[in-house]
């Protein structure tokens, strides 16, 4: 001899966000007479999901025709599942009365919602850093469920190992977030480099999501300077060049000084790009040596990307050159003062 049993055959059901969840429930008898109700959670704070007898539940439909006299299937379908719907659902048989009283509950079905992580967002340091320095990159992704997730860091395809990752919250939640910080040592060749954060999750079916950061936005490669004296172009004129090599980014201002006095200031414009993404630039200065009685100290001073200026000097010997009478001009700058080198 038996009494009615409420059977929820599925201990757990996993559904992708946006899909419908079918929660199965059958009873073994038509008696006692009374409605079926579905709840999420147990105890006094449980949430009513569906009441066979009354109420409006727009997202819930019954799987079978519950108006049929012999119906004992009270399975329901919940549409447009979101992570907030996760929880344990109980099919509860009520006994007809005033009011109806709870007669028996099913064992419950745990609904887990598979929600895709958001596209990883990678952010680097606020200020640029120079080669040999270690910089930190962060990667964040949100809204995923279940909690299990894998995050990897790469630099130009090579997996990085120096990183720390946290998944929050630690306890049960409808959805989770991941936050990871990776340390990257910069090299002079990193202008074209990329740092990639790769997130793998069960919802992505083996096709991980990636977020990238270009090291070109992080790195500053300071220039190297070389000042050279070219053969005499014409009598009493000396061509001095300042070669600015391997710098990044392009923002650069060059000042020529003659014996400490500003002769000319210019901004790098027509630069050449190296294979590694850095730039080269050359500036030249025509010096009228006949205007000088003594040797001239020429200085090429470069201010790169707002950093303190670096300089390189060159001593120009003038004693061997005949002096023009009556000339007080310190220097003559004629013609083009920029030249591309390849």
């Amino acid at each position: 001899e038996e009494e009615l049993q409420v059977i929820q055959p599925d201990k757990s059901v996993s559904v992708a966000a946006g899909e419908s969840a079918i929660l199965h429930c059958t009873v073994t008898s038509l008696i006692p007479v009374g409605p079926i109700q579905w709840f999420r959670g147990a105890g006094p704070a449980r949430e009513l999901i569906y009441n066979q007898k009354e109420g409006h539940f727009p997202r819930v439909t019954t799987v079978s025709e519950s108006t049929k006299r012999e119906n004992m299937d009270f399975s329901i379908s919940i549409s447009n599942i979101t992570p907030a719907d996760a929880g344990t659902y109980y099919c509860v048989k009520f006994r007809k009365g005033s009011p109806d009283t709870e007669f028996k509950s099913g064992a419950g079905t745990e609904l887990s919602v598979r929600a895709k992580p958001s596209a990883p967002v990678v952010s680097g340091p606020a200020a640029r850093a120079t080669p040999q320095h270690t910089v930190s990159f962060t990667c964040e992704s949100h809204g995923f469920s279940p909690r299990d997730i894998t995050l990897k860091w790469f630099k130009n395809g090579n997996e990085l190992s120096d990183f720390q990752t946290n998944v929050d919250p630690v306890g049960e939640s409808v959805s989770y977030s991941i936050h990871s910080t990776a340390k990257v040592v910069l090299t002079r060749e990193d202008v074209h480099s990329q740092v990639i954060c790769e997130v793998a999750h069960v919802t992505l079916q083996g096709d991980p999501l990636r977020g990238t950061a270009n090291l070109s936005e992080t790195i500053r490669v300071p220039p190297t300077l070389e000042v050279t004296q070219q053969p005499v172009r014409a009598e009493n004129q000396v061509n001095v060049t300042c070669q600015v090599r391997k710098f990044y980014p392009q923002r650069l201002q060059l000042t020529w000084l003659e014996n400490g006095n500003v002769s000319r200031t210019e901004t790098a414009s027509t630069v050449t790009e190296n294979k590694d993404g850095t730039y080269n630039w050359m500036s030249w200065l025509l010096v009228n040596v006949s205007a000088h009685r003594d040797d001239v100290k020429l200085t090429c001073q470069v201010e790169h990307d707002g950093q303190p200026a670096v300089s390189k000097s060159h001593d120009l010997k003038v004693s061997a050159h005949p002096k023009e009478q009556g000339s007080n001009t310190a220097a003559e700058n004629t013609g083009s003062n920029e030249r591309n080198i390849y």
Epitope: S29, V33, R69, E70, K96, G97, S98
Partner: antibody, heavy 120, light 108 residues
Framework: QVQLQQSGPELVKPGASVKMSCKAS????????LSWVKQRTGQGLEWIGE????????YYNEKFKGKATLTADKSSNTAYIQLTSLTSEDSAVYFC?????????????WGQGTLLTVSA | ENVLTQSPEKMAVSLGQKVTMTCSAS???????LHWYQQKSGASPKPLIH???NLASGVPARFSGSGSGTSYSLTISSVEAEDAATYYC?????????FGGGTNLEIK
Amino acid sequence: QVQLQQSGPELVKPGASVKMSCKASGYTFSEYVLSWVKQRTGQGLEWIGEIYPGTITTYYNEKFKGKATLTADKSSNTAYIQLTSLTSEDSAVYFCGRFYDYDGGWFAYWGQGTLLTVSA
Amino acid sequence: ENVLTQSPEKMAVSLGQKVTMTCSASSSVSSSDLHWYQQKSGASPKPLIHGTSNLASGVPARFSGSGSGTSYSLTISSVEAEDAATYYCQQWSGYPWTFGGGTNLEIK
């Protein structure tokens, strides 16, 4: 048409047990709930309990738990009520009845009743 | 349980007379869940009215029912000899299903 045919009268001694039957015809026996109702001489009607033959599940009036046991045999379309530890209080006419429908709640069909007399 | 009290317990009326009997519930009953039966001596109960006011198959139109909440009534507009019987109300609002104690109608 729906018919409920009950077994004949019973005369039993106090302390004994009795099993009475109700044979259904004219409908699909396993699909409808059958109830049992007690009526003592010159008294009102008391609902004892009900059985769903489809899965042989029962539900009882608390007052009759331990006294009555409801069973059914789907192969013979027959429902049974067994009463144990009989006393004179159990002397009554016992009816089987079927609701009009699952959600009708009114007894549209009744058996003719079985008279149980408990006497030494 | 929901106790149904019928009154009067007995009544004797003349043919053609109008008769009203009541059924009072100890707790509210949905109108769709209140039913009436007629039982003649030595016979099983016969359905008379279901859901407060709906006549069962074959029941004459002189029978009618009304009521709501805890108060219900059965009326016979013009009593005939064959109406001599005991009348029972029954509720299906909650377990256990209960019947009233009956009203015995006698024809003078």
